[in-house]
């Protein structure tokens, strides 16, 4: 999450010993309060591994460290999904999995983690400095995204930091460690607050920036607990982007937007953009490959072209993705 909260600046205390001590005891509670507020913030981890057997084959593993239920997971490369990245796979916990080349196999590992194997050959195969991103959506609470890539000096078979091999144990140790520190911090904060209970409250100085806190992104929840999680995105090396699988629409807008009804409630079903036959029941999909329809089994890859939904001010390159016309 990248929701930001503004903390009002405190009026500096009077100089002198009391002022210096007062300043320290005033700053510390704010720091501890921020830690306490963000203690329950869900996080996403990403592990990128190059297979020793196939040098250009990658395994991406992603996990969600949070208590909320996941409604959708999107894996992309070349940057965050929706910001120039190309979608590789979309996983729904109940309805199935859809994936696009060069993704070979996407699957759920646990209820909160997924893995994706990428094909090792072809023009669209990844290379060592490709950035992979995972976005976990929990509708309507919010969505959390993190990115990772192989370190430049990675040997085949080695996984990218920061996630060690026994992920579950490492995560657990981290959670316990951080929880311990935060618990101590929260207790200390309460102690400080009780000590300062009878002192006059410091005057709050309005923040120099806009009085209104910046609104979270469209998908971000408006919870204060999401305040301090800033996911650093790795720099995208454009020379190592996947091959242009999709072509942007010449007019910049989505090719299907104009075909949607402007007033009528029900329109007759015309020729579909990617599957004119009715979509089968849960657990079964219509796959479109080379213009041929094929009925697939339970949770197969859904290699279907899509359409760009919205225009992009940055031009055609940003429109690359599973929604371009193949």
């Amino acid at each position: 999450m990248r929701t930001e909260a503004q903390v009002p600046a405190l009026q500096p205390p009077e100089p002198g010993l009391e002022g210096a001590m007062g300043h320290r005891t005033l700053v510390l509670p704010w720091v501890l309060l921020t830690l306490c507020v963000t203690a329950g913030t869900p996080e996403v981890w990403v592990q990128v591994r190059m297979e020793a057997t196939e040098l250009s084959s990658f395994t991406i593993r992603c996990g969600f460290l949070g208590s909320g239920s996941i409604s959708l997971v999107t894996v992309s490369w070349g940057g965050p999904n929706g910001a120039g990245g190309t979608t590789l796979a979309v996983l729904h916990p109940e309805r199935g999995i859809r994936q696009w080349a060069p993704a070979r196999q996407a699957r759920w590992e646990t209820q909160s983690s997924i893995s994706l194997i990428l094909e090792g050959s072809g023009a669209s195969s990844p290379c060592a400095n490709t950035t992979f991103c995972c976005k976990f959506a929990s509708f309507p609470e919010g969505s959390w995204e993190a990115c990772g890539s192989l370190p430049p000096s990675s040997d085949p078979g080695l996984s990218a930091p920061p996630t060690p091999a026994p992920i579950l144990r490492a995560d657990l140790a981290g959670i316990l460690g951080v929880s311990g520190v935060l618990l101590f911090g929260c207790v200390y904060l309460l102690h400080l607050l009780r000590r300062h209970k009878h002192r006059p409250a410091p005057r709050l100085q309005p923040s120099r920036t806009s009085p209104q806190a910046p609104r979270a992104r469209a998908w971000a929840p408006s919870q204060a607990s999401q305040a301090a999680l800033h996911v650093p995105y790795a720099t995208i090396n454009t020379s190592c982007r996947p091959a242009t699988l999709d072509t942007a629409h010449p007019h910049g807008g989505p090719s299907w937007w104009a075909s949607l009804p402007t007033h009528a409630a029900h329109r007759p079903q015309g020729p579909a953009a990617w599957a004119s036959t009715p979509i089968p029941a849960r657990g079964s999909f219509v796959s479109v490959e080379n213009g041929l329809y094929a009925q697939a089994g339970e949770r197969p890859p859904h290699t279907g072209p899509g359409l760009t939904l919205f225009p992009d001010p940055r031009g055609p390159r940003a429109m690359e993705g599973p929604l371009g016309v193949r």
Partner: nanobody
């Protein structure tokens, strides 16, 4: 990131009408469906009040068929939901969302902050 901003919610009497709007802006969204979802107070999220996929197929929840109409603005990227003959059970936070189709259902990947619709006399 794609930004979806809903508007048009409010308080309306039973039998009344409201028109919700969803303005889409920002970067490319890589999905294949859009629609309106709602969450009633103390209840779970509805599968999808009204959704459109990239083939132009429209799907309505049984509870709103014949009363709600989903449509779009051609020039600007705006999605609408015309709600007529509103009932008390339509009271909810309505979300505009864009996502991916699974088994004929639109699963949200990006959504707005929601707009409150209250149907009460």
């Amino acid at each position: 990131e794609v930004q979806l901003v809903e508007s048009g919610g409010g308080l309306v009497q039973p039998g009344g009408s409201l028109r919700l709007s969803c303005a889409a802006s920002g970067f490319t969204f890589s999905g294949d469906c859009m629609g309106w979802f709602r969450q009633a107070p103390g209840k779970g999220l509805d599968e999808g009040v009204a959704t459109i996929d990239n083939a132009g197929r429209i799907k309505y929840a049984d509870s709103v068929k014949g009363r709600f109409t989903i449509s779009h603005g051609n020039a600007k990227y705006i999605l609408y939901l015309q709600m007529n003959s509103l009932r008390a059970e339509d009271t909810a936070v309505y979300y505009c969302a864009a996502g991916w189709t699974f088994g004929g259902q639109c699963s949200p990947a990006d959504w707005g902050q929601g707009t409150q619709v209250t149907v009460s006399s």
